[in-house]
């Protein structure tokens, strides 16, 4: 976990002010509106059944 303004989060994660820690970019498929997703290069779309089973 990284504090903002220090070393960046590890590859595949991005800083979340809401969570106060680095968060997994993979989570952006499920939680695309999370603040940290803005820092993730590409949030892949959710499979159809995950959102609307």
């Amino acid at each position: 976990e990284q504090a903002p303004g220090t070393a960046p989060c590890s590859r595949g994660s991005s800083w979340s002010a809401d969570l106060d820690k680095c968060a997994d970019c993979a989570s952006c498929r499920a939680r695309p509106h999370s603040d940290f997703c803005l820092g993730c290069a590409a949030a892949p779309p959710a499979p159809f059944r995950l959102l609307w089973p």
Partner: antibody, heavy 119, light 111 residues
Framework: EVKLEESGGGLVQPGGSMKLSCVAS????????MSWVRQSPEKGLEWLAE??????????HYAESVKGKFTISRDDSKSRLYLQMNNLRAENTGIYYC??????????WGQGTTLTVSS | DIVLTQSPASLTVSLGQRATISCRAS??????????MQWYQQRPGQPPKLLIK???NLDSGVPARFSGSGSGTDFTLNIHPVEEEDAATYYC?????????FGGGTKLEIK
């Protein structure tokens, strides 16, 4: 310290109903997806139901095996999760875990409450 | 539904050695970027505990002797060096779609 505490388990006759409760503390309950997971010797770990956030209009999802029989709900003001179970059968016997996850995994688990369906 | 098959069902590993547990999914649970597979540890009488999310990402507080790898349909949990406290049952779980499913578990014993 994160804590999830289930209650409401016990012995119920086949065809009966039961409502499980779970009270959460130590994390921002209203920002976490919540689920119920059952464990039994016969079927191992089974995800049963999930409820998402207010911003998702509290969307719910169920395993086929419990769809129409179980209802998951939450009360964010009380940091509580519920599972209403109707028309219970022997195969619903097991340990019921309350779980919370920021997304599509289970970060936090309660100690579980045991449900026994038997005559 | 996606079926997760774990192997072996049980294994015994000497203290300090490597434990390797496999999980095979009946269909791919990966995109080009991420894999939607988790690993949990369950000690006797306790609930499961999240170890690894998205195939490779260690949960906070989990010792670095645990590692996850794999993509597509084949995933692996490695523990090295194994310690006495690692005696437990380990489960994989996918989050590719609903319903989420778990593997049948692998019981690890330490000698």
């Amino acid at each position: 310290e994160v804590k999830l505490e289930e209650s409401g388990g016990g012995l119920v006759q086949p065809g009966g109903s039961m409502k499980l409760s779970c009270v959460a503390s130590g994390f921002t309950f209203n920002n976490y997806w919540m689920s119920w997971v059952r464990q039994s010797p016969e079927k191992g770990l089974e995800w049963l139901a999930e409820i998402r956030l207010k911003s998702d209009n509290y969307a719910t999802h169920y395993a086929e095996s419990v769809k129409g029989k179980f209802t998951i709900s939450r009360d964010d003001s009380k940091s509580r999760l519920y599972l209403q179970m109707n028309n219970l059968r022997a195969e619903n016997t097991g340990i019921y875990y309350c779980t919370g996850g920021f997304a599509d995994y289970f970060d936090y688990w309660g100690q579980g409450t045991t449900l026994t369906v038997s005559s | 539904d996606i079926v997760l098959t774990q192997s072996p069902a049980s294994l015994t590993v000497s203290l300090g050695q490597r434990a390797t547990i496999s999980c095979r999914a009946s269909q791919s649970v990966s995109t080009s970027s991420y894999s939607y597979m988790q690993w949990y540890q369950q000690r006797p009488g306790q609930p499961p505990k999240l170890l690894i999310k998205y195939a490779t990402n260690l949960d906070s507080g989990v010792p670095a002797r645990f590692s996850g790898s794999g993509s597509g349909t084949d995933f692996t949990l490695n523990i090295h060096p194994v310690e006495e406290e690692d005696a437990a049952t380990y489960y994989c779980q996918h989050s590719w779609e609903i319903p989420y499913t778990f593997g049948g578990g692998t019981k690890l014993e330490i000698k």
